[in-house]
Interface confidence: low
């Protein structure tokens, strides 16, 4: 009698190795004998396919040669005409011996940085990667993190990171090593001792010492008022990733010298620049009497801080006078720099407006210090913190020289708006008024070492700090 | 370090619709597939729905079919499910989880990361 | 639809104690099978996956097993922190279906 079709053995998950054979049995009773069509993932599995072999009616599927690839479900169906088709499904599992597909590279990294090293596998059962630094497994800790994917991550890497790297990809069929990768950490061009400022006799000799540090060993050279030093001698030494320069000087005029520190990191440079001013005694005289000329302000540094077009005075005591004061104010903001968002625009146009005075041009042209008031506003308000700290440094010694002196007015010493109006400058980029101050946080002192006026608004006075420099 | 972070839950009324995503991290949402799983109070947890985006391929649990939809935007690496025609029996914390792979092989790695899960009621 | 029968649906052990407990699908399945604790107001987090793999950072006193339409999870010795809920779960070509879960408690 006919019979409809009846799967008796339900195909079975089958793990199978790569390269190994793997056969699925779907046994049928049925009257008359059915026709029996295999799918893999439901796409149907040809008869002729040279990868397979399809045995006893159809109801034994081998795969001759199992590779990672072949992973799915596969299904058969038999049908004879009698009643509906019947389907059985089951699970091929490609169990494979771990793989490293993407093995680490090795890796040139500026310390700071994030690097990756990649370690990506296949397996299955998947594969567990573990890391191997030197002979030793690595640790992981919060820096450092063996990723899901497997590859290793190592956050703001240090000079000790650098060294050999492999990874470890285990599963219960094997294991297998990537080859040893180095990761190599540079480290940015950084100025260990800074060179120091002198007042000398005129005809003295100076030696000037600047000391770097950096991975590849910096490259040390000086610049004297902008220009490459033209006379005097440099001796230099390196020891343990360390150069020392030493410049020998014969004094004749006052002059800006800066030590500038290089190293490359592929196609960039990082530099580091000291500076340090040598002054002639006989030449210090009274700032009334101080030579210069005014110019419009075309240097980089101060460029969002000073009026567009603004004319500045420039000191002819310096060589170039415009190449000084611009690596004056560069050096001064570098010593200032780890500075909150609110003090910072604010220092950065004090800074700028003293080294950079505005001139009043006439048969004398003469530099305008800032007023009084507006510097207090900046010691006191804006930087309240940052200048206690400056000024614990300077009792301590810890700045160079007076290098800092240049840099930072002493607020007390500048003359005060009332005095003169016209006498003093105001910092176009900082107006305040006692409505804005109600944001800022108590001061440092007990009370302010002046009594902080009502200043008339003016369209020079275009700054106040409001929610952009806001507190919070 | 990978994290799934789920949002959107909330209060809505019978028939409402809701938007929940789930914002990745620490891997990428198109090597991966990603699942929503949902638990309603004091209950076991229930498979919702799952996207593989490197297929665009999609699969739902029948409660749900033809009112959710599962979506993900690679380039946020995020995954979405748009809830609409909401039933009272749709009130559950609604997980989004992560399993290697493509809807073919990521049953066989189990669902390694899990969100925290955002809690969806319906009521009137 | 594929059933997961989970069993039992409770059960309260001492520490130190060895615990199973079993899955039976409703019909011949792969061994895409993954065993979750959950703890209360937290996400399940994944113990074993393919029937019998431990998952990284997983004590090794949990195993997983396989036998026809049966799966297994054997905790060989309970920990106190291992008091929670435990459930299956398999996946066909992505139709996921969980177990009702088994709650372990302290006896």
């Known amino acids: 009698l006919p019979k409809a079709p009846v799967i008796t053995t339900p195909l079975e998950t089958v793990d199978a190795l790569v390269e190994e054979v793997a056969t699925f049995m779907c046994a049928v009773e049925s009257y008359p004998q059915p026709e029996i069509s295999w799918t893999r993932n439901k796409i149907l599995i040809k008869l002729f396919d040279t990868r397979y072999s399809i045995r006893e009616n159809g109801q034994l599927l081998t795969i001759l040669s199992v590779e990672d690839s072949d992973d799915g479900i596969y299904c058969c169906t038999a049908n004879n005409g009698v009643g509906g088709a019947v389907e059985s499904c089951g699970a091929l599992q490609v169990k494979m011996k771990p793989k490293i597909t993407r093995p680490p590279i090795n890796v040139k990294i500026i310390e700071g940085l994030k690097a990756v090293l990649p370690c990506t596998t296949m397996g299955n059962p998947k594969p567990s990667v573990s890391w191997i630094k030197g002979d030793s497994p690595l640790r992981e800790n919060s820096r450092i993190a063996v990723l899901e994917s497997g590859s290793l991550r190592i956050h703001n890497v240090q000079k000790e990171d650098a060294g050999q790297y492999r990874c470890v990809a285990k599963n219960s069929l094997g294991t297998a090593y990537s080859k040893v990768v180095k990761l190599e950490v540079e480290v940015f061009a950084r100025i260990l001792r800074a060179p120091e400022s002198h007042n000398v006799t005129f005809g003295s000799f100076v030696t000037l010492h600047c000391t770097a540090t950096g991975i590849p060993v910096p490259t040390i050279t000086w610049i004297e008022n902008g220009n490459a030093v033209s006379s005097g001698s440099i001796q230099e030494s390196v020891k343990d990733r360390v150069i020392d320069s030493r410049l020998q000087l014969f004094i004749t005029k006052p002059g800006l010298y800066t030590c500038i520190a290089t190293n490359k990191h592929g196609e960039k440079f990082s530099t580091a620049k000291a500076a340090a001013t040598i002054s002639i005694a006989e030449w210090s005289k009274p700032q009334k009497d101080n030579k210069g000329y005014c110019a419009q302000y075309r240097g980089e540094v101060c460029n969002a801080v000073l009026a567009k077009d603004a004319l500045v005075f420039l000191n002819t005591s310096y060589a170039d006078p415009e190449e000084a004061q611009e690596l004056l104010v560069h050096t001064a903001w570098n010593e200032l720099k780890v500075v909150s968002p609110v003090c910072r625009p604010a220092a950065e146009a004090l800074l700028c407006n003293h080294i950079f005075q505005e001139c009043s041009p006439g048969v004398v042209p003469t530099p305008i210090p800032i007023c009084r008031e507006y510097c207090l506003a900046v010691k006191e308000l804006f930087c309240a913190k940052e200048w206690l700290v400056m000024e614990e440094k300077t009792h301590r010694g810890l700045y160079r020289s007076e290098m800092h002196l240049l840099s930072v007015p002493e607020c007390s010493k500048l003359p005060s708006m009332h005095w003169d109006p016209t006498a003093c400058a105001r910092l176009p980029h900082l107006d305040y008024n006692k409505e804005n101050l109600k944001t800022f946080p108590p001061m440092t002192s007990s009370k302010p070492s002046v009594d902080i006026p009502n200043l008339p608004s003016s369209s020079s006075s275009s700054f106040s700090v409001s929610p952009t420099y806001s507190m919070t | 370090e990978v994290q799934l972070v789920e949002s959107g839950g909330g209060l809505v009324q019978p028939g409402g619709s809701l938007r929940l995503s789930c914002a990745a991290s620490?891997?990428?949402?198109?090597?991966?597939?990603i699942h929503w799983v949902r638990q309603a109070p004091g209950k076991g947890l229930e498979w919702v729905a799952s996207?593989?985006?490197?297929?665009?391929?999609?699969s739902y649990a029948d409660s749900v079919k033809g009112r959710f939809t599962i979506s993900a935007d690679t380039s946020k690496n995020t995954a979405y499910l748009q809830m609409n025609s909401l039933r009272a029996e749709d009130t559950a914390v609604y997980y989004c989880a992560r399993s290697e792979g493509d809807r073919y092989v990521s049953g066989y790695f189990g669902m390694d990361y899990w969100g925290q899960g955002t809690l969806v009621t319906v009521s009137s | 639809d594929i059933q997961m029968t989970q069993s039992p649906s409770s059960l309260s052990a001492s520490v130190g104690d060895r615990v199973t407990i079993t899955c039976r699908a409703s019909?011949?399945?792969?061994?895409?099978v993954a065993w979750y604790q959950q703890k209360p107001g937290k996400a399940p987090k994944l113990l074993i996956y393919?029937?019998?793999s431990l998952y990284s950072g997983v004590p090794s006193r949990f195993s997983g097993s396989r036998s026809g339409t049966d799966f297994t999870l054997t905790i060989s010795s309970l920990q106190p922190e291992d008091f929670a809920t435990y459930y299956c779960q398999q996946s066909g070509v992505w139709l996921i279906t969980f177990g009702q879960g088994t709650k372990v408690e302290i006896k």
């Open positions: 620490g891997f990428t949402v198109s090597s991966s597939s």
């Open positions: 393919s029937a019998s």
């Open positions: 019909q011949s399945v792969s061994s895409a």
């Open positions: 996207i593989s985006s490197s297929y665009g391929s999609t």
